[in-house]
């Protein structure tokens, strides 16, 4: 459909509340350092303008694209260069280059302090102005996660508001709020990581990579739907994510709503698990569909070999319609293997494709590809064995100890990577233990590998901004589906020149005593990385001794009457001790 005014069309489709929310998210994801009030002003102006276009689509500037309108708004900010430096250079470009330029300036690791929930203050804000409270939440999440899936953020904002509606009435606000906020925070962080991977796959590996990922995922989730149905949903979903990743948030949210509507209208041919979802209001409905439980497998599935090995037309199908044929293979394989990770399914499809590419050029293709399914077993065994070993290590060491083992492992593999990044990534990798190791056997593989893909994508995104390791660049860019095996296969870097010992790195202060447990751990793990960068060949025994001594040193000083004085005296002794242990 063509509309005289795109902004009027989106305003009418989405309604004022969602329109304002999405515009706020869009501005917050681009201008991540601007105060909330500045964004509110921009949103108000854009909304007023949209309303004039709804009243008269022929009004001045209403025919302009949303990119043009948003870009003009950003570029009109007087302090743009002062606060954002070379982002202001984008304003010298014309659309669509200007929008591309804005996208390139999104910062995945903005210097914004961590949000610390204060139940009393938050409840006061909530009761004073619910609308502002909702907007502030969108702003705070969007500026910290510039690729967050905008329509899904609107959903989380509703859940956030509901938590406060309930808990601010409670006698003990903190007891009600804090666990709920923490639970929501984990969900939001996972959602941010999932979307970041989707955007990375589209932007770095192309739309086809994203479609293959979605095809495998949806085939696992909706095994009763046939290939044609899944293909249609994949195509529409790719459009939605391309738009959101490209900053076209209004179009993205609108198209996502259309897709949810289509899925619900056709749920009989898609999945038996969508009934509850489809009775919900729009944002909950879309979220529910995205999180839907896996449907049961149809009972009458034929062995895959019939169509992909025994059928005499395999090479004809492959040669004449490569993408469709390989798509059908991925669909059929995925729906039969809900227990496999998406990355593993895509690796299997790659092997199948490579085998046909080779065999179909030979004299006797059927004889050549007859054993293709046997080639898949090593691909399945590799992650299964790895998960088994790591889960055993997790059971033995516990979460903190397992994280430390990963810190050692990854610092030795890629010591050039910055210390904060190594700590963040290794800590997240370590969470795979509590997330997946307790799961039933048939869920472990997909849980672990799909989660690791999210964490390694975070490493790749951070590393791309300031590349320091050829190994990391290689693993991140060569193949999306082989990232995890690539990182797993890295060995300690023997070419690394150890860092000089800097005493300041091991200087601690009284604030350590009052830090929450997780922040205390981060301090210790930061020291561990620095230690390894100084002594890459330190033995496990030496490291264990240093960590034990460190814990004792901190405990001693935090029990002393004057924390700071203790750290001043004991700190230098501790440094000498470290050097002695590692000598």
């Amino acid at each position: 459909d063509t509309y005289k005014s795109e902004i009027a069309h989106r305003f009418k489709d989405l309604g004022e509340q969602y329109f304002k929310g999405l515009v706020l998210i869009a501005f917050s994801q681009h201008l991540q350092q601007c105060p909330y009030e500045e964004h509110v002003k921009l949103v108000r102006e854009v909304t007023e303008f949209a309303k004039t276009c709804v009243a008269d689509e022929s009004a001045e500037n209403c025919d302009k694209s949303i990119h043009t309108l948003f870009g003009d708004k950003l570029c009109a900010i007087p302090s743009l260069r002062e606060h954002y430096g070379d982002l202001a250079d984008c304003c010298e470009k014309e659309e669509p280059e200007r929008n591309e330029c804005f996208l390139q300036h999104k910062n995945d690791n903005p210097d914004i302090p961590k949000l610390k929930p204060d139940p009393v203050a938050l409840c006061a804000d909530f009761q004073e102005d619910e609308q502002k409270f909702w907007g502030k939440y969108l702003y705070e999440i969007a500026r910290r996660h510039p690729y967050f899936y905008a329509p899904e953020l609107l959903y989380y904002a509703i859940i956030y508001k509901d938590v406060f509606s309930e808990c601010c009435q409670a006698a003990d606000k903190a007891a009600c709020l804090l666990p709920k906020i923490e639970h929501l925070r984990e969900k939001v962080l996972t959602s941010a990581a999932k979307q970041r991977l989707k955007c990375a796959s589209i932007q770095k590996f192309g739309e086809r990579a994203f479609k293959a990922w979605s095809l495998a995922r949806l085939s696992q989730r909706f095994p009763k739907a046939d290939f044609t149905e899944i293909s249609k949903i994949v195509t529409d979903l790719a459009k939605v994510h391309k738009e959101c990743c490209h900053g076209d948030l209004l179009e993205c949210a609108d198209d996502r709503a259309d897709l949810a509507k289509y899925i619900c209208e056709n749920q009989d041919t898609i999945s038996t698990k969508l009934k509850e979802c489809c009775d919900k209001p729009l944002l909950e409905k879309s979220h529910c569909i995205a999180e839907a439980k896996r449907d049961e497998l149809p009972a009458d599935l034929n062995p895959l070999e019939h169509d992909f090995v025994e059928d005499k037309e395999v090479c004809k199908n492959y040669k004449e319609a490569k993408h469709v044929f390989l798509g059908t293979f991925l669909y059929e394989y995925s729906r039969r293997h809900p227990d496999y990770s998406v990355s593993l399914l895509l690796r299997i499809a790659k092997i199948y494709e490579a085998t046909l590419e080779d065999c179909c050029a030979k004299e006797d293709p059927p004889a050549c590809y007859a054993t293709v399914f046997d080639k898949f077993q090593p691909l399945v065994d590799e992650p299964k064995n790895l998960i088994k070993q790591n889960c055993e290590l997790f059971e033995k060491l516990g979460e903190y100890g397992f994280q430390n083992a990963l810190i050692v492992r990854y610092t030795k593999k890629v010591p050039q990577v910055s210390t904060p990044t190594l700590v963040e990534v290794a800590r997240k990798l370590g969470l795979v233990g509590s997330r997946c190791c307790k799961r039933p056997e048939e869920e472990r593989l997909s849980c672990a590998e799909d989660y690791l893909s999210l964490v390694l994508n975070r490493l790749c995104v951070l590393h791309e901004k300031t590349p320091v390791s050829e190994k990391v660049t290689k693993c991140c860019t060569e193949s999306l589906v082989n990232r995890r095996p690539c990182f797993s296969a890295l060995t300690p870097d023997e070419t690394y020149k150890p860092k000089e010992f800097v005493e300041g790195t091991f200087t601690f202060h009284a604030d350590l005593c009052t830090l929450p447990e997780d922040e205390k751990q981060i301090k210790k793990q930061t020291a561990l990385v620095e230690l390894l960068k100084h002594k890459p060949h330190a033995t496990e025994e030496q490291l264990r001794t240093v960590l034990g001594n460190f814990a004792a040193f901190v405990q001693k000083c935090c029990a002393a009457p004057d924390h700071e004085a203790c750290f001043a005296v004991e700190g230098p002794k501790f440094v000498i001790e470290i050097r002695g242990i590692l000598a």
Epitope: D226, T228, N302, D307, D311, K312, N317, V324, F325
Partner: nanobody, 126 residues
Framework: EVQLLESGGGLVQPGGSLRLSCAAS????????VAWFRQAPGKEREFVAG????????YYADSVKGRFTISRDNSKNTLYLQMNSLRPEDTAVYYC???????????????????WGQGTLVTVSS
């Protein structure tokens, strides 16, 4: 889910031609891999020709290559089999079969097709 109804069979002399039709309902024929099979008295059902769903790739049994042509008209949701240079050994009941959601895979294995028409008899005799 898919209903198929064949027509166009009959008696024809050797060397003659016939055009079989298969009307589908309940599903768009262009989304479905469809095929013609035949069964002569006292023999097993055998694959004759097939066409992919969504992608017009055609498949033929060696015995009919160059004589038979499979096609479909998406607007009419109908599958056709144009049979030329007919021989007595082509005498059989011809069945239309469908595999929904299988765009390309037009297997020659009858068991893999969940939907079948009731068949139309073709007799080639002088």
């Amino acid at each position: 889910e898919v209903q198929l109804l064949e027509s166009g069979g009959g008696l024809v002399q050797p060397g003659g031609s016939l055009r079989l039709s298969c009307a589908a309902s309940g599903r768009y024929i262009d989304e479905t891999a469809v095929a013609w099979f035949r069964q002569a008295p006292g023999k097993e059902r055998e694959f004759v020709a097939g066409i992919g769903g969504g992608v017009d790739i055609t498949y033929y049994a060696d015995s009919v290559k160059g004589r038979f042509t499979i096609s479909r008209d998406n607007s009419k949701n109908t599958l056709y089999l144009q049979m030329n240079s007919l021989r007595p050994e082509d005498t059989a009941v011809y069945y239309c079969a469908a595999r929904p959601g299988k765009p390309l895979i037009t297997s020659k294995v009858a068991d893999l097709y969940p939907y079948w028409g009731q068949g139309t008899l073709v007799t080639v005799s002088s």
